[in-house]
């Protein structure tokens, strides 16, 4: 038999950040190689990642056709070396994935604090609009043009010289806060759809950024800062 | 100072798709601003249809959902409302609208503030 | 849904008196995205309020709004005669995006 000895795929799961979509599974492959199927609920199965070795298949190229329908993979197992017959009619192992709707799943991104300008008692605090490759008239759109106002940002600041934190929140990339004169602030952002229910609905925290340093003054921490 | 003039059939019959474009003039639909679809039935109050913003990300009232498809064309600067199988009870007035960033307690959130005239669109056979 | 109630229904004035419209949401709305329209007959809404409190550009005085959670009021502290018209919140925070029923601010 053309799939003897080799082993169904298991715990088929997709890892998405931004978009960039990944699926991944089990077992590191011993003598048996796999091939991976992506199709909407609706459309016709389509084949990647040809007889890899690998347990990970980057079907990003698929999703962002249209990030909002739902997909499933499929990965089928094969022997190693096995060349595509066409007088074979046995179906090879395969596992399903789970369904996967991309605009609703894709984890966010940490975000990264773009700039920031104080003019007397307020900060323009700007934060940097992610490239996706999810694309409209073969042109890249950011993670703003795909989300639009499901996507808001929340900002974080304190006074360099306390603990107690403030927060705004913006429906574009841009805040404008108050400040005290005088006084220094760190700021970190966080992405944020709050539409979402799971556990995917916020980004991790961008890196802090903090007023009154001159570049790479601070290196020790770990933070990089803007100097206006 | 921008501008938007709705156009389309004002008599569409019934189970037929209603089609409509609103023109932006005085500045660049793809200024970072939403565009929207409301209507208002005879006498009544307003209803949200939906948005859309330059780079085709669609937002629709759930209600409507299934019927309704908002369009761009930066081209033209213009963005359209197509609103399939209609029934009398989608007789209205049709407004196109901006949505622009307004500054509110440290960031920016986005409120209708510029309206086209409105345009009646009747179903009937 | 939010769904928006607004209260009374009409209100019978005179120019120079005080118009105090309320607006009651089925559950909390951000204060960010409670909007009061203008209409009158034949014209399109116009924007007033934004933020619950905040005029828009080019709003007289007279106009102010309040509240947060789910009670928003909307004050005409002196009628004048171009006031009169049919007013509108909206809360534009949860998709679908509501209105009120309206208020009709009429001439006693």
């Known amino acids: 038999s053309g799939t003897t000895n080799t082993v169904a795929a298991y715990n088929l799961t997709w890892k998405s950040t931004n978009f960039k979509t990944i699926l991944e599974w089990e077992p590191k492959p011993i003598n048996q190689v796999y091939t991976v199927q992506i199709s909407t609920k609706s459309g016709d199965w389509k084949s990647k990642c040809f007889y890899t070795a690998d347990t990970e298949c980057d079907l990003t190229d698929e999703i962002v056709k249209d990030v909002k329908q739902t997909y499933l993979a499929r990965v089928f197992s094969y022997p190693a070396g096995h060349v595509e017959s066409t007088g074979s009619t046995e179906e090879p192992p395969y596992e399903n994935s789970p369904e996967f709707t991309p605009y609703l799943e894709t984890n966010l991104g940490q975000p990264t604090i773009q700039s920031f300008e104080q003019v007397g008692t307020k900060v323009n605090v700007t934060v940097q609009d992610e490239w996706t490759l999810v694309r409209r008239n073969d042109t890249f759109l950011s993670l703003r043009d795909v989300f639009g106002k499901d996507l808001i940002y929340t900002l974080y600041y304190w006074k360099s010289s306390s603990s107690g934190k403030k927060t705004a929140k913006t429906n574009t990339n841009e805040f404008l806060i108050d400040v005290d004169k005088g006084e220094n602030y760190c700021f970190s952002v966080q992405a944020v759809i709050p539409s979402r229910r799971t556990a995917n609905r916020k980004s991790t925290d961008s890196p802090v950024e903090c007023m009154g340093h001159e570049k790479g003054e601070s290196r020790e921490t770990g933070h990089h800062h803007h100097h206006h | 100072q921008v501008q938007l003039q709705e156009s389309g059939p004002g008599l569409v019959k019934p189970s037929q798709t209603l089609s409509l474009t609103c023109t932006v003039s005085?500045?660049?639909?793809?200024?970072?601003?939403?565009w929207s679809w409301i209507r208002q039935h005879p006498g009544k109050g307003l209803e949200w249809i939906g948005e859309?913003?330059?780079?085709?990300?669609?937002r629709y009232n759930p209600s409507l959902k299934s019927r309704v498809t908002i369009s761009v064309d930066t081209s033209k600067n213009q963005f359209s409302l197509k609103l399939s199988s209609v029934t009398a009870a989608d007789t209205a007035v049709y407004y196109c609208?901006?949505?622009?960033?307004?500054?509110?307690?440290?960031?920016?959130?986005?409120?209708?503030?510029?309206w086209g005239k409105g345009t009646t669109v009747t179903v009937s056979s | 849904e939010i769904v928006l109630t607004q209260s009374p229904g009409t209100l019978s004035l005179s120019p120079g008196e005080r118009a105090t419209l309320s607006c009651r949401a089925s559950?909390?709305?951000?204060?960010?995205?409670l909007a009061w329209y203008q209409q009158k007959p034949g014209q399109a809404p116009r924007l007033l309020i934004y933020?619950?409190?905040t005029r828009q550009t080019g709003i007289p005085d007279r106009f102010s709004g309040s509240g947060s959670g789910t009670d928003f009021t909307l004050t005409i502290s002196r009628l004048e005669p171009e006031d009169f018209a049919v007013y509108y919140c909206?809360?534009?925070?949860?998709?679908?995006?509501?209105f009120g029923g309206g208020t009709k601010v009429e001439i006693k």
């Open positions: 609208a901006r949505d622009a960033p307004y500054y509110y307690g440290g960031g920016y959130y986005y409120y209708m503030d510029v």
């Open positions: 005085g500045g660049s639909i793809s200024s970072g601003q939403y």
């Open positions: 859309i913003y330059y780079s085709g990300s669609t």
């Open positions: 559950e909390s709305v951000d204060s960010s995205y």
């Open positions: 933020g619950a409190s």
């Open positions: 909206q809360q534009a925070g949860v998709v679908p995006y509501t």
